[in-house]
Interface confidence: low
């Protein structure tokens, strides 16, 4: 069972349902309308924003656009058909794909990634497919909070 519990707090971005708890014994607590998985919290948007707008929204929630640790990180979203902005963009300065925190993309995460013609920002879906798009395109997005 994934470590998860819902926390009865009201996040800044919405007057979300004030859900009562039967608190699990495990380690994770997530705001309402956030999803807990493997001791991380994810906000999976239903609205669309540009990559920068998405990044700013996540920052306002004390989180960041999703930085994938491995390709199965979004297994819990297997039923979703949508592409979502993640925290990966192309740095002209470094001629490399960098995560929001400045770290480089692992060659093992997307083995065929070098065949992409960079369009600056990356959208990702739960099937493990990555799509490079103009950062001004509006997509859904995923924010991630690491709890431990």
């Amino acid at each position: 069972k994934n470590s998860f519990t819902k926390l009865s707090v009201e996040p800044a971005y919405t007057p979300g349902p004030n859900i009562e708890l039967q608190k699990d014994s495990d380690c994770c607590s997530c705001h309402e309308k956030w999803v807990g998985y493997r001791c991380n919290c994810y906000f999976i948007s239903s609205e669309e924003k540009t990559w920068n707008e998405s990044r700013h929204f996540c920052a306002s929630q004390k989180s960041s656009l999703l930085q994938l640790q491995n390709r199965d990180e979004l297994d819990f979203m297997s039923s979703s058909q949508h592409f979502y902005w993640i925290g990966l963009s192309y740095s002209e300065e470094h001629t490399a794909w960098l995560w929001e925190n400045g770290s480089a993309l692992s060659q093992y995460l997307f083995p065929s990634f070098e065949t992409f013609k960079p369009k600056n920002c990356i959208a990702y879906n739960s099937k493990g497919n990555a799509l490079d798009e103009s950062c001004e395109t509006k997509n859904r997005y995923i924010c991630k909070q690491q709890l431990i």
């Epitope: 994934n2 007057p15 349902p17 859900i19 009562e20 239903s46 979703s80």
Partner: antibody
Framework: QVQLQQSGPGLVKPSETLSLTCTVS??????????WGWIRQPPGKGLEWIGS???????YYNPSLKSRVTISVDTSKNQFSLNLSSVTAADTAVYYC?????????????WGQGTMVTVSS | EIVLTQSPATLSLSPGERATLSCRAS??????LAWFQQKPGQAPRLLIY???SRATGIPDRFSGSGSGTDFTLTISRLEPEDFAVYYC?????????FGQGTRLEIK
């Protein structure tokens, strides 16, 4: 695609406990992006949310019914259940189970077929 | 709890006409509002979530608008199968609540 199949008695005696079960097919009840809920509708009236449950067992209930409601989940059987104790004629209604996504929408998107429950001696 | 008031209680229109249904919340629910359609003997069907996003498979003649406390469901051109009862539901604050419904009937 996901479907919800309800089962349980259609007649319950006053003061007894109403018990209904909702079986999820075409998907896993253990998906972490869904809550599962119960809603009821008295004859000729509107909808009333009863409560919801997460696969981990976390629940939240309508305060107006909280003292009498227990919702439980059995992940091994891919089903969740409603128990409503000390029923009266006012609990006569069609009871629905439904899925509540956590992917931004947070609105009941898939419903069971409904079970008409009559409280009568 | 947040009370949702729907108006009118009954709306009588003819096929091909435009229907406008209103839902007013007793306090702000942001855009956490959904609309459902229910036909006799059937379970409700989700039409709109997030005040304005159409659910999967819902025809584009259905549209939702509004935020805060005032919301509208519009059916641009009524089809015979659209005559039913419509409910709004808020999920911005617990407990989740529904409006009392608007019956859309054939004139």
């Amino acid at each position: 695609q996901v479907q919800l199949q309800q089962s349980g008695p259609g007649l319950v005696k006053p003061s007894e406990t109403l018990s209904l079960t909702c079986t999820v097919s075409g998907g896993s009840i253990s998906s972490i992006i869904y809550y599962w809920g119960w809603i009821r509708q008295p004859p000729g009236k509107g909808l009333e949310w009863i409560g919801s449950i997460y696969y981990s067992g976390s629940t939240y209930y309508n305060p107006s019914l909280k003292s009498r409601v227990t919702i439980s989940v059995d992940t091994s059987k891919n089903q969740f259940s409603l128990n409503l104790s000390s029923v009266t004629a006012a609990d006569t209604a069609v009871y629905y189970c439904a899925r509540l996504p956590l992917t931004g929408e947070f609105a009941f998107d898939i419903w069971g077929q409904g079970t008409m429950v009559t409280v009568s001696s | 709890e947040i009370v949702l008031t729907q108006s009118p209680a009954t709306l009588s229109l003819s096929p091909g006409e435009r229907a406008t249904l209103s839902c007013r919340a007793s306090q702000s629910v942001s855009t956490y509002l959904a609309w459902f359609q229910q036909k006799p003997g059937q379970a409700p069907r989700l039409l709109i979530y997030g005040a304005s996003s159409r659910a999967t498979g819902i025809p584009d003649r259905f549209s939702g608008s509004g935020s805060g406390t005032d919301f509208t469901l519009t059916i641009s051109r009524l089809e015979p199968e659209d005559f039913a009862v419509y409910y709004c539901q808020q999920y911005g604050s617990s407990p989740i609540t529904f409006g009392q419904g608007t019956r859309l009937e054939i004139k």
